[in-house]
């Protein structure tokens, strides 16, 4: 059950996609990735207030457990509900080849 | 792939499996199930250091970024990788039923 | 596997439209840096691109003939269309379309060919 | 537009010989070259990206090189099965262009 997607912290302070710019040096991948020189990576950042975006019971659970013990306990993080697929121009043994990564950008997010 | 399982911050310290006993009362269920009386609930909590745990290339992505960027990126989040079911007698309009819950105990964890 | 297929009417007349559809497998164009492109070779001759389009949509054309050309996708079905109006006898040729990951003609499909004669 | 000049419109070699086909850029396109193997009756085919490495499948024979606006592609040992066309392609900027070909062919 994706729970309430009005946040209550302010617009855009919650759970949502961002996108974020880096370069293959940014990411680490410049000896092995050819293409793209700079990414545009979709992830998810922000607050999981109670119930927002709760993503099953266990992040519900999660939420009301987080209020009665906060030092045991987080709140709810902000991840991936699922991913949009990237090609990569890369370097391999046998020579250079596009390869699919399934779950490099994040399509939309929730709280668990 | 599942990077390393060695925690740079001391034992325990890194993202994984916890149990926290809670009643009916903690978790909000006293008024819709009848049992169990008290929950023991497997969580994922700990910190997320480089490569520790990631859960994919999304994640890796996440630990360079939040090393370059940390006030924009947050590091990776420790949670449920899968789940272990549960049962739970509760209140119906129709009487009491038994029923499952596929996605409230974290059966193991991950850093994403 | 990838594979690539185009498929064109085979003969036009001078002025008409040139309708071709690029039918592929092994790869999505819902994929990120995944694109199609169109390129033309004339018998004997060397190669031309034409236009190319992208998973988000993005669509780039030869500006010698971009007047002429509309690139367009079915992504559910696995198809890239393009279409050029008002062929002459300077179009005829072998129409290749190619898997295109950021700008890299991978893989090629057979191609079709077009022959214009009134 | 970018013209990619390929100087050379066949060039004669034998068997177990090493060629070199060059490909010359009107500008700087930095190392955004491509080459593709043409045989006849055949669709091109990738055997170079970003002006030195080797597609993934193609032998070790064929090498490429350069940057800037000079290009070249090496084949060591050439093999029955190397005669064919090579096109150079840039895709430093819009719209991408091809040389004009180089015919490899028997002495």
């Known amino acids: 059950a994706r729970n309430g997607d009005h946040c209550p912290l302010g617009p855009g302070r919650c759970c949502r996609l961002h996108t974020v710019r880096a370069s293959l040096e940014d990411l680490g991948w410049a000896d092995w990735v050819l293409s793209p020189r700079e990414v545009q990576v979709t992830m998810c950042i922000g607050a999981c207030p109670s119930q927002f975006r709760a993503a099953n019971m266990h992040a519900q659970i999660k939420t009301s457990l987080h209020r009665l013990k906060p030092d045991t306990v987080p709140a709810p993080c902000c991840v991936p509900a699922s991913y949009n697929p990237m090609v990569l121009i890369q370097k391999t043994d046998t020579g250079v080849s596009l390869q699919t990564y399934d779950d490099l950008l994040a399509k939309d997010c929730h709280c668990i | 792939a599942r990077n390393g399982d060695h925690c740079p911050l001391g034992p325990g310290r890194c993202c994984r499996l916890h149990t926290v006993r809670a009643s009916l009362e903690d978790l909000g269920w006293a008024d819709w199930v009848l049992s169990p009386r008290e929950v023991q609930v497997t969580m994922c909590i700990g910190a997320c250091p480089s490569q520790f745990r990631a859960a994919n290339m999304h994640a890796q992505i996440k630990t360079s970024l939040h090393r370059l960027k940390p006030d924009t990126v947050p590091a990776p989040c420790c949670v449920p990788a899968s789940y272990n079911p549960m049962v739970l007698i509760q209140k119906t309009d129709t009487g009491v039923s038994l029923q499952t819950y596929d996605d409230l105990l974290a059966k193991d964890c991950h850093c994403i | 596997q990838v594979t690539l297929k185009e498929s064109g009417p085979g003969i036009l007349q001078p002025s008409q439209t040139l309708s071709l559809t690029c039918s592929f497998s092994g790869f999505s164009l819902n994929t990120s840096g995944m694109g199609v492109s169109w390129i033309r070779q004339p018998s004997g001759k060397g190669l031309e691109w034409l236009a190319h389009i992208y998973w988000d949509d993005d669509k780039r054309y030869n500006p010698s003939l971009k007047s002429r050309l509309t690139i367009s996708k079915d992504t559910s079905r696995n198809q890239v269309f393009l279409k050029i109006t008002g062929v002459d006898t300077a179009d005829t040729a072998a129409y290749y379309c190619a898997r295109t990951g950021w700008d890299f003609f991978d893989i090629w499909g057979q191609g079709t060919t077009l022959t214009v004669s009134s | 537009d970018i013209v990619m000049t390929q100087s050379q419109k066949f060039m004669s070699t034998s068997v177990g010989d090493r060629v070199s086909v060059t490909c010359k850029a009107s500008?700087?396109?930095?190392?955004?070259v491509a080459w593709y193997q043409q045989k006849p009756g055949q669709s091109p085919k990738a055997l170079i990206y970003s002006a030195s490495y080797r597609y993934s499948g193609v032998p070790d024979r064929f090498t490429g090189s350069g940057s800037g606006t000079d290009f070249t592609l090496t084949i060591t040992n050439v093999q029955s099965e190397d005669l064919a066309e090579y096109f150079c392609q840039q895709y430093k900027s819009y719209p991408l262009t091809f040389g004009a070909g180089t015919k490899l062919e028997l002495k």
């Open positions: 500008q700087n396109v930095g190392s955004n």
